[in-house]
Interface confidence: low
Amino acid sequence: DAHKSEVAHRFKDLGEENFKALVLIAFAQYLQQCPFEDHVKLVNEVTEFAKTCVADESAENCDKSLHTLFGDKLCTVATLRETYGEMADCCAKQEPERNECFLQHKDDNPNLPRLVRPEVDVMCTAFHDNEETFLKKYLYEIARRHPYFYAPELLFFAKRYKAAFTECCQAADKAACLLPKLDELRDEGKASSAKQRLKCASLQKFGERAFKAWAVARLSQRFPKAEFAEVSKLVTDLTKVHTECCHGDLLECADDRADLAKYICENQDSISSKLKECCEKPLLEKSHCIAEVENDEMPADLPSLAADFVESKDVCKNYAEAKDVFLGMFLYEYARRHPDYSVVLLLRLAKTYETTLEKCCAAADPHECYAKVFDEFKPLVEEPQNLIKQNCELFEQLGEYKFQNALLVRYTKKVPQVSTPTLVEVSRNLGKVGSKCCKHPEAKRMPCAEDYLSVVLNQLCVLHEKTPVSDRVTKCCTESLVNRRPCFSALEVDETYVPKEFNAETFTFHADICTLSEKERQIKKQTALVELVKHKPKATKEQLKAVMDDFAAFVEKCCKADDKETCFAEEGKKLVAASQAALGL
């Protein structure tokens, strides 16, 4: 539909509250360093302008595109040049180049202070004093730290954040009520951000076709009773939604996501039997629920895939007539039969099938050539199965912290050029796959584990892209989206790496470590472990374990000492000397 005023159209569709929240998210995701008050001022100006357009769509500038209106507003920020440097050059460009330029300057690892949680009473007072500002600040702080956070989903998080404070600030024990809820929102938020980051990377780095293939596989697993045409329609609509959100078109994205949820609920009989509860919820909860809904049961008596995709004499004819449609059907049929496979595995199988048809349909006897194509799938299926089995056994043997340490050592040896904070963050997240997925039965382990690992490895890829230091990381990240995990798994110790110079300062610790939370103390120890491996990449597991055990004992001893700082200084020197001797540094 062509609307005389796009801004009026979206304001009317979304309502003032959601409109303002989404504009704030959009601005904070673009200008990540700007103070909160500046963003609120810009949002209020845009909102007032939108209201004039609702009143009269023919009013001056109301016919301008949202990118033009928002870009013009962002480019009024006085400190753009000194705060953002070359990003200010974007303002010299015309749309759509200007928006593309802003997108390219989004920073996955902005230099912002860590969010420190104030005392519960302080938070409750702030919440009661000005609820609207309190909630806007939440949107702003999350959006600027996560510039690809899925905006309509952030509205859902904000709704839960508000509900937590509304309930807990009047509870007898405010902290006992509130803190677990905030921890849960924080952890879920990080996971949601990382999942969306992979969707945006998929679209931006590998194109719409790659994203659509992912969506066909995932939706076919989730809705195995739906017809191929229905799945295709959902994939097209979902691709539009995510393309918009990843492109900074947050008002359109939220609007289209609401339309998609409405369509799914109106047509649930032909989509899935699991949607009933979701469809009874209000909009934000409904959309979230649909996105997380469990897989429907597979239809009984599905015929063998071989008939249509191997035995039929029309395989090459069907493939030649409409390659992507035929491959889409293959992916749909395979995925709906295999909820036990990861999406990336299904995509590898589809790629193998495509490669085989490309080769065989040009051969003298195509059928003879592709007759054994399904046999090629066996090793592709067994590789992740074996890897997950081995790693879950290791996780069960070691527990999460030590399993993370094993991965830290493994990945530091593979790609030692990567920064220590990135290696720690990524390896800790890789290690969480154990507690997240190993508890599941065999049939759910692979989709849980391998698709989660894809999300975590994408974090490594986007962080590395900002400051590329390793050809091996660049290679694994850019060659193939679906083969990233096998590519990293296949990496051996980097023999070309020149060990880092030993620096005693890196291994000097102070009494402040004693007041840290258990998680922060683990991160300190894991940081030291990465640095050790960078100094001594050929160190054995046993040598590293001995040094880390000594280190843990040293921290425990000094944290119990009366004069902690002196203990850290004196015992620290001894520890460094002993570690150097043990590792031959």
Epitope: K205, F206, R209, K475, E479
Partner: nanobody
Framework: EVQLVESGGGLVQAGGSLRLSCAAS????????MSWVRQVPGKGPEWVSA????????RYAESIKGRFIISRDNAKKTLYLQMNSLKPEDTAVYYC????????GSQGTQVTVSS
Amino acid sequence: EVQLVESGGGLVQAGGSLRLSCAASGFTFGSFGMSWVRQVPGKGPEWVSAIDSGGTDTRYAESIKGRFIISRDNAKKTLYLQMNSLKPEDTAVYYCTIGQSTSRGSQGTQVTVSS
């Protein structure tokens, strides 16, 4: 050792055409997506265009869509950029990169478009 050597740049009048080449060695060229990036002195690199490893999926920056065509010949280990309807604002050093990185790994080739 990974090497990328660009050629084909030069001085051309607005509206004219150039074809840039990038000869690759030291890695499995046919396994990598490739990009063209350009840089004006004093400014940051600007991504121009990308192509997947097989040459089937191509992407372009809005500023050059419809004017430039990216292609590759895996047998010759060469990446190409056909530049038509050149404008003065296309003046820059052009260089090719592996994947979609905008980090420079080569010398580049100068393209100057006069008005």
